[in-house]
């Protein structure tokens, strides 16, 4: 199962997907594309990095964060219905078969009338990041939950202590912060 | 490896439309990054021009705007540069460079020299 | 539009000396800055990209810091290669070059 992330028609939606470089500068090749992650690369390229930069992308998909220091979360502006789907995010971890995969189901809803802020999902992990959206409306202020730091071998030991609570599935499908190196 | 190269006539006549066009080896322009003209008058310092991306998209220098026009031939993976109205002022070794979506630049032509007179 | 002011234009030095160039831009641009080497009648090759991380193959002794209007390349001992003529630019998100230094033999 994917985890779901909500944004209204018109404002700006963020998926968020995180890992840490080795070194700083030291970048890990990162595609996200549209549709689930496939067995290599991704479908329907949206944006994708190499060891520098962003060399391909697509208009009104960003990068916001600072990528350089791991954080590849997709921004997407100006959102329609059809922004709806299921998306992937693939950490290229150089090696056979070393990729980490997170698949991010982003569920579009119509604008509401007359808009209030409300937050956009309840997560339970310490830190949270804290994202306004721009839009056609009001600013709205979302809180994502931000993971731990943790190492490729830990990720199953944990997702097992945690399997009763709500953190579990986000730690499985897309919040674990990927340690590289 | 990525190789670009200017190609175009050294000598333009005033008012008339200066062309220029940068073929690429060792990597497709439609695969990825953004493809910029930059030209240096002589003795002077460089100034961006303007790019075309991998999907066909173009930013241009806002001093350049009205007179620029940066277009692609992908089935001789071939970008060219169009300058309108030229004066002597335009006169300058033109590169062509391939860089990210943040326009900075990683491959250089190796330049073309350029000069407007009549 | 951002400017990129320069400094010094150009300046003399002898091999082995610590050599400091800066930059200031008109504006807060981020580290959304990169430096060129140029050798005349060629073309600019890249040294530094976002402030501070080198480009690849590029010596050591090459550094960039750096973030928001001041900017700085730092050769810490200077070779004879290294005589040349450096750019800074900003991208943010149109390109603009600062004015070049020029690194010449005391």
């Known amino acids: 199962s994917e985890v779901e992330y909500r944004a209204e028609v018109g404002q700006n939606a963020y998926l968020p997907c995180f890992y840490t470089p080795a070194a700083p500068g030291n970048l890990v090749p990162v595609c996200w594309g549209k549709g689930a992650c496939p067995v290599f690369e991704c479908g329907n390229v949206v944006l994708r990095t190499d060891e520098r930069d962003v060399n391909y992308w697509t208009s009104r998909y960003w990068l916001n964060g600072d990528f350089r220091k791991g954080d590849v979360s997709l921004t997407i502006e100006n959102v329609t219905l059809a922004d709806s789907g299921i998306y992937c995010c693939r950490i290229q971890i150089p090696g056979i078969m070393n990729d980490e995969k997170f698949n991010l189901k982003l569920v579009i809803k119509p604008a509401k009338v007359t808009p209030a802020p409300t937050r956009q999902r309840d997560f339970t992990a310490a830190f949270p990041r804290m994202l306004t959206t721009r839009g056609h409306g009001p600013a709205e202020t979302q809180t994502l939950g931000s993971l731990p730091d943790i190492n490729l071998t830990q990720i199953s030991t944990l997702a097992n202590e945690l399997r009763d609570s709500r953190l579990a599935n986000d730690l499985r499908d897309s919040g674990a912060t990927i340690r590289i190196g | 490896q990525v190789q670009l190269q200017e190609s175009g006539p050294g000598l333009v006549k005033p008012s008339q439309t200066l062309s220029l066009t940068c073929t690429v080896s060792?990597?497709?322009?439609?695969?990825?990054?953004?493809w910029n003209w930059i030209r240096q008058p002589p003795g002077k310092g460089l100034e961006w021009m303007g790019y075309?991306?991998?999907?066909?998209?173009?930013s241009y220098n806002p001093s350049l705007k009205s007179r620029i026009t940066i277009s692609v031939d992908t089935s001789k993976n071939q970008f060219s540069l169009k300058l309108s109205s030229v004066t002597a002022a335009d006169t300058a070794v033109y590169y062509c460079?391939?860089?990210?979506?943040?326009?900075?630049?990683?491959?250089w032509g190796q330049g073309t020299t350029v000069t407007v007179s009549s | 539009d951002i400017q990129m002011t320069q400094s010094p234009s150009s300046l003399s030095a002898s091999v082995g000396d610590r050599v400091t160039i800066t930059c200031k831009a008109s504006q807060n641009v981020g580290a959304n800055v990169a430096w060129y080497q140029q050798k005349p009648g060629k073309a600019p090759k890249s040294l530094i990209y976002?402030?501070?991380y080198r480009y690849s193959g590029v010596p050591s002794r090459f550094s960039g810091s750096g973030s928001g209007t001041d900017f700085t390349l730092t050769i810490s001992s200077l070779q004879p290669e290294d005589f040349a003529t450096y750019y800074c630019s900003q991208y943010n998100p149109y390109n603009t070059f600062g004015g070049g230094t020029k690194v010449e033999i005391k």
């Open positions: 060792g990597y497709s322009i439609t695969s990825g990054f953004a």
């Open positions: 075309i991306s991998h999907s066909g998209s173009t």
């Open positions: 976002s402030a501070s």
């Open positions: 460079a391939r860089g990210y979506r943040s326009p900075w630049f990683a491959y």
